[in-house]
């Protein structure tokens, strides 16, 4: 077969080929940020000629053109400046309202390099309607000027702009407009991952319902959905495998889907995952009717087995058939469970479509969506039972109109996105399911995204201050209790001056809480073994503080999971009959267990907890500490089995002021506290300039550094005695 000519350079940009110069290969242009390629792509035809998708005239030279943002077409009850036909990247537009109107949204907006405006639609509103003035997004024209209950407004976009969101919205009884805000965008525009991840994540979190099945009442961010213990989510992942998707991109589709599966299983809900790859025909790799669809490892392995070559005989994009196979799956499940049963009616369904182009065969995908809505009986009351996310990847041939038509329309949410490339998709899936925004007390959730603050990464972490100075750290283990070290409290029982500083999204300094009650282990006595020549002894170094008020859960304040509780059992996705011993075997399951603690400056530092034989050699070093233990004969007199040991090799050592803080591990995107920082042989902060300076111990130091942490598995009786009505403990 003839190959296509190679004179296809783009001035100022680059290009990639999906299958070299052979027929069927897709040539994709890209330009530096702030510019877009025209045309975006070309396809090598069997005749050996390049064809530009959608082009009517002959092949023109490819160029990088400057990105521009759409201008306002009309702005009600106010003025905007400057008035231009379109705006360059970095250009601003400012809005002001006439007297009697209040500006809602962003008074100044800037054109971003992706052709999208930053901020929110500016609206001048006088608050007269049943619903607020829905505004007119930049580049849009609205018809309908009444905002009473039942009134409708319609939108269209000027010139060649594409509408995403709802073209028609209705003012509902609750004073909220139906659907989602329409946005007019350039056909070449795309979404930045940092915008998509939170938008997608918020919507998804709503759908998941912030479910913590051990809670009596459940509230999520916005939509108050309750997926009870009996509730169930069916997640359908549809991966485009058509010709225009390169093998490498398909791998990233798979990897992104794996991230999604991994993350979704870390929620405490019952979930079944279907995997469907599609080109000209769909291929079901995992059906929700298969019991394995509830098992994360099975789902991931079926994803891993998805083969790019499965579709090499039919390379079109038949989105209709892919969605129709979801419909058929639903139909079969409905027949199995019975149409009228709660078991069927209470299942929530989420479809994630990953595609790189418009469907070009098999009929309109919208028809399949209509069938799906029909079988699930989606109406205003049951709107929460279906979410369709349409994600286009690679700006080239993605059809905004089609994606928008497929994506769900829900107030304050977005379900249709276009990303620049598969790398951006991977980024989104890495960060989208940020459970840390949930408002209930789901435990052990930290925000793992790259741009999260230290406190968002470890939201259980608190600082304890006796007077003005910080002295110890601790961990929230519920919305009112903090776990810390007993040795922090050496001034008798007057805690009236003490404060606990808890993370707060509204202040970088956190929020201070008074202590209602301090429960210090009666077994703790630092001088208990003084007459044996052990000048300091830290057995039973554990304390609980009850805060004077409950902490409001947020991105910055949330409890860590305590092992041996039902809350931790759910987070570990363990079966119901699990015991405390099972948790210990799962969490402390190696000779050297990687763990973390939080430094004075809030960063997360790494240690390795030594178990078994390695614990013995880790602890042995204490015999070399002659000041604190002048005539020690048996190390176990000092290092009892209440302690975990770390500090060997490359471990960081905690400073004195880090005492009481959690020693924790990560499993399945959740965090579990296995110990608390107690004492050590080396202080890396001693005499340092500030919280950011730590000194490594010299290699020649005698004794070498060692750190000892109270092992929570050994403190169960005491924890149960004081927290029995706060947490749900498992049998020992």
């Amino acid at each position: 077969a003839p190959s296509c000519p190679q004179n296809v350079n783009i001035s100022g940009g680059t290009f990639t080929l999906s299958h070299g110069w052979a027929p069927g290969s897709l040539l994709t242009y890209s330009c530096p940020q702030g510019l877009y390629p025209s045309p975006a792509s070309r396809l090598c035809k069997s005749s050996g000629q390049w064809q530009t998708p959608g082009a009517t005239r002959s092949l023109s030279k490819a160029v990088c053109k400057p990105v521009r943002c759409p201008a306002p077409v009309s702005f009600e009850n106010g003025i905007y400046t400057p008035r231009l036909g379109s705006y360059p990247v970095g250009g601003n537009v400012s809005f002001e309202c006439e007297d009697g109107f209040i500006l809602r949204g962003s008074p100044v907006r800037q054109c971003r390099p992706n052709g999208m405006w930053d901020g929110e639609t500016a609206v001048c509103d006088n608050g007269a309607g049943h619903c607020p003035n829905p505004g007119i997004s930049l580049g849009a024209v609205r018809t309908g000027f009444r905002f009473g209950h039942g009134d409708k407004v319609r939108y269209r976009c000027s010139s060649n702009l594409v509408l995403t969101g709802s073209s028609e919205r209705e003012c509902q009884g609750n004073g909220v407009w139906s659907g989602t805000e329409p946005i007019c965008r350039q056909p070449y525009s795309y979404d930045f991952p940092e915008d998509v991840a939170p938008a997608l994540g918020t919507s998804f979190s709503h759908m998941l319902g912030a479910t913590n099945p051990t809670q009596k009442t459940k509230e999520s961010l916005g939509r108050k959905i309750q997926i009870q213990r009996s509730g169930h989510l069916n997640l359908y992942l549809l991966l485009d495998c058509s010709q225009s998707v390169s093998e490498n991109d398909f791998l990233i589709f798979k990897e992104s889907a794996s991230l999604m599966v991994d993350r979704i299983f870390s929620f405490e809900i019952n979930v079944s995952v279907a995997i469907i790859t599609f080109a000209s025909e769909p291929k079901v790799l995992m059906s929700v009717l298969n019991d394995n669809s509830r098992d994360m490892t099975e789902v991931i392995s079926s994803l891993e087995n998805a083969n790019y070559k499965d579709h090499e005989n039919g390379t079109g994009t038949n989105t209709y058939a892919a969605l129709n196979s979801v419909y058929l799956m639903m139909n079969n499940q409905m027949r199995l469970l019975g149409m009228e049963t709660m078991a069927w009616q209470e299942i929530r369904h989420a479809i994630i479509l990953l595609t790189d182009g418009k469907s070009n065969m098999g009929g309109s995908p919208k028809t399949a969506v209509d069938h799906i809505r029909e079988i699930l009986n989606i109406n205003q009351k049951r709107n929460d039972y279906l979410d369709i996310y349409a994600i286009g990847v690679g700006k080239l041939d993605v059809d905004w109109r089609e994606l928008n038509e497929l994506g769900s329309k829900k107030d304050g949410e977005r379900h249709a996105f276009i990303l620049q490339d598969t790398k951006a998709l991977h980024q989104v899936f890495e960060h989208m399911l940020d459970v840390s925004k949930l408002t209930d007390t789901i435990c052990g959730v930290g925000n793992m995204s790259a741009n999260a603050s230290d406190q968002e990464r470890t939201p259980w972490h608190v600082t304890i201050k006796p007077k003005s100075q910080e002295t110890c750290r601790g961990a929230l283990i519920s919305d009112q209790w903090v776990l810390t070290a007993a040795h922090c409290f050496r001034d008798g029982n007057d805690h009236s001056l003490w404060r606990v500083n808890v993370g707060d999204p509204k202040s970088q300094w956190g929020k201070e809480f008074l202590i209602e009650k301090a429960v210090i282990s009666p077994g703790f006595d630092v001088f208990a073994k003084k007459n044996q020549g052990i000048l300091e002894f830290y057995g039973d170094d554990i304390a609980l503080l009850k805060l004077a008020q409950k902490v409001k859960m947020s991105t910055h304040a949330r409890p860590i999971c305590l092992p041996c509780t039902m809350e931790a059992n759910l987070a570990l996705r363990r079966p119901q009959g699990s015991t405390c011993r099972d948790h210990e075997n799962e969490l402390l399951n190696k000779q050297s267990v990687p763990a973390h603690f939080v430094a004075l400056n809030g960063s997360k530092l790494n240690i390795n907890l030594k178990m078994g034989v390695e614990w013995t050699s880790c602890a042995e070093v204490v015999s070399q500490e002659k000041t604190m233990f002048p005539n020690l004969t048996d190390v176990r007199e000092v290092v009892t089995d209440q302690f975990l040991c770390s500090g060997t090799q490359e471990d960081e050592s905690p400073c004195k002021g880090e005492s009481g803080g959690a020693v924790f591990l990560e499993r399945r995107f959740r965090f579990f506290q296995v110990g608390l920082v107690s004492w050590g042989l080396y202080n890396p902060c001693l005499g340092s300039a500030d919280k950011n300076s730590r000194k490594r111990a010299p290699r020649s130091k005698v004794p070498p550094p060692r750190d000892f942490h109270i092992n929570l598995f050994r403190m169960q009786p005491w924890l149960r005695q004081h927290l029995g009505d706060v947490l749900n403990f498992l049998p020992l």
Epitope: S468, G657, G687, S688, D690
Partner: nanobody, 122 residues
Framework: QVQLVESGGGLVQPGGSLRLSCSAS????????MGWFRQAPGKEREFVAS????????EYADSVKGRFTISRDNSKNTLYLQMNSLRAEDTAVYYC???????????????WGQGTQVTVSS
Amino acid sequence: QVQLVESGGGLVQPGGSLRLSCSASGHTFRSYYMGWFRQAPGKEREFVASISWTGGSTEYADSVKGRFTISRDNSKNTLYLQMNSLRAEDTAVYYCAADYSGDFLLSDLDSWGQGTQVTVSS
């Protein structure tokens, strides 16, 4: 907060000894880690030694290890620094400090004495 007053400084020949004292007011002395810092002219303040609130553990800067000994008497609310084999480079103003956590971070310390001058010279 603990109020601290140092004493015992003076002029001493190289190889000689001095004993510094730091008297603390406030009944909470026994619950604080105590430490000594020093500052030579034109230099940063540097850590010299510290002792835990129990008196059970001590830490020293490498430059004074084996020559200086820190101790405390909780019944007298007093901290001591015994300095032997003094060298010219030990010349500095010596400050006593109290710290509840035991890290003695310079940015966080709010209990300092006014200092006592030690000069080692022949």
